[in-house]
């Protein structure tokens, strides 16, 4: 039994790193494999991760961390029963991907504007709360091609566009994701898409002179 | 509960021995790392000792080394503090402590025993 | 090694109060910092660690905040059980981690 690919891990900057590895072939990873993980100089027991399938030859292990201090640096030990098949380290800091906003509504009590919110992801405790910037993907169920994304470079977690730059009696998708600069992050997953129907109806001047127009055809 | 029990604390003349003991109860003593944490008369804390939890890495400040030596017996659920060529300044309680889960601040203490160190 | 300053080393103050204590470092330590409590003739008792997490069971009346050399205790709303002497301790890097020399919160 080999290790194919070596681990990668990520962390969400929080409470979970994730680490994924292929083997040399089909593995029951969590009956074969155990991944220890244990901060330097830290001088109780390593703790261990049972890892999980990630299709036939590869593996998914989620490690269980206190909250992330960006000098942490662990050691990751992969062992077989008895035998050590790799041994590597990972420092959360240098390898985050964001925790997915969630809650992401959409707003269209008010005519002419569509205000999109969603909730950070971190308590405002976690150093990320106030470090993250989002993209928001708009995209129309009907037609492919109308596809947006609008990046947010604010810290506020909200949007507003004019419901005139979306087509009128159709119905759109929205998702958003974060990333946050001053760790370098990938960016998160997209959050669940919310759903909405854009009935947008211009003012009356444009529906007056619209149809008179089309009268005289 | 959480306990830890500390015993073996007494007068002891300069240039003596004696040993600590620390009896642990209420968690799973081998997967921790333990220390000796000492307090003289009126003053601060002082980490004297630290060892992990299979006991094959240990550490001392300079004032200590090669004077003191910790110890642990997992099967005992036992920490120990030997202690010779004591000096007046030793003269302190000394505390045991357990490291906590995730980081190596001291989560939970013993009650302390007193060591005097006279003549 | 590295050393830590606390200041103040005592402070007299009311019930009610709202108290703060401050412990620098000599290096930086990122947020690897322990604050406890300590009543005369007894045990320290765990309050902070990683700067600003509060240990299982401590009142949120108590808060921590800081990183790299400078670090602050807070307490909101002194309560007569508060009375004590506080310290701060680093766990950055090897173990030969040190605690400030301590502050006496007295009653005014």
């Known amino acids: 039994m080999k290790v194919l690919q070596e681990p990668t891990c990520v962390s969400d900057y929080m409470s979970i790193s994730t680490c994924e590895w292929k083997m040399n072939g089909p593995t029951n990873c969590s009956t074969e494999l155990r991944l220890l993980y244990q901060l330097v100089f830290l001088l109780s027991e390593a703790h261990t991760c049972i890892p999980e399938n990630n299709g036939g030859a590869g593996c998914v292990c989620h490690l269980l961390m206190d909250d992330v201090v960006s000098a942490d640096n662990y050691t990751l030990d992969l062992w077989a029963g008895q035998q050590l098949l790799w041994k590597g380290s990972f420092k959360p800091s240098e390898h985050v991907k964001p925790r997915a906003p969630g809650n992401l509504t959409v707003h269209t009590n008010v005519s002419d504007t569509l205000l999109l919110t969603w909730s950070n992801p971190y308590p405002p405790d976690n150093y990320l709360y106030n470090h993250l910037t989002y993209a928001v993907n708009i995209w129309s169920e009907n037609d492919p091609a109308d596809f947006r994304i609008y990046n947010v470079t604010y810290l506020e977690p909200s949007l507003r566009i004019a419901a005139s730059t979306l087509k009128s009696g159709i119905s759109y998708r929205a998702r958003v994701r974060a990333w946050a600069q001053c760790y370098n992050t990938t960016w998160s997953e997209w959050s669940p898409s919310t759903k909405w129907h854009n009935s947008y109806r211009e003012p009356f001047e444009q529906h007056h002179h619209h149809h008179h127009h089309h009268h005289h055809h | 509960e959480v306990q830890l029990v500390e015993s073996g604390g007494g007068l002891v003349q300069p240039g003596g021995s004696l040993r600590l003991s620390c009896a642990a109860s209420g968690f799973t003593f081998s997967t921790y790392g333990m220390s000796w944490v000492r307090q003289a008369p009126g003053k601060g804390l002082v980490l004297v000792a630290t060892i992990n939890s299979n006991g094959g890495s240990t550490s001392y400040p300079d004032s200590v080394k090669g004077r003191f030596t910790i110890s642990r017996d997992n099967a005992k659920n036992t920490l120990y503090l030997q202690m010779n060529s004591l000096r007046a300044e030793d003269t302190a309680v000394y505390y045991c402590?357990?490291?906590?889960?995730?980081?190596?601040?001291?989560?939970?203490w013993g009650q302390g025993t007193l060591v005097t160190v006279s003549s | 090694d590295i050393q830590m300053t606390q200041s103040p080393s005592s402070l007299s103050a009311s019930v009610g109060d709202r108290v703060t204590i401050t412990c620098r470092t000599s290096?930086?330590?990122?947020?690897?910092l322990a604050w406890y409590q300590q009543k005369p003739g007894k045990a320290p008792k765990f309050l902070i660690y990683n700067a600003k997490t509060l240990a299982e069971g401590v009142p949120s009346r108590f808060s921590g905040s800081g990183s790299g050399t400078d670090f602050t205790l807070t307490i909101s709303s002194l309560q007569p059980e508060d009375f004590a002497t506080y310290y701060c301790q680093h766990y950055y890097g090897p173990p030969t981690w040190t605690f400030g020399q301590g502050t006496k919160v007295e009653i005014k």
């Open positions: 290096e930086n330590i990122y947020s690897y």
């Open positions: 402590a357990r490291f906590f889960r995730f980081r190596n601040a001291m989560d939970y």
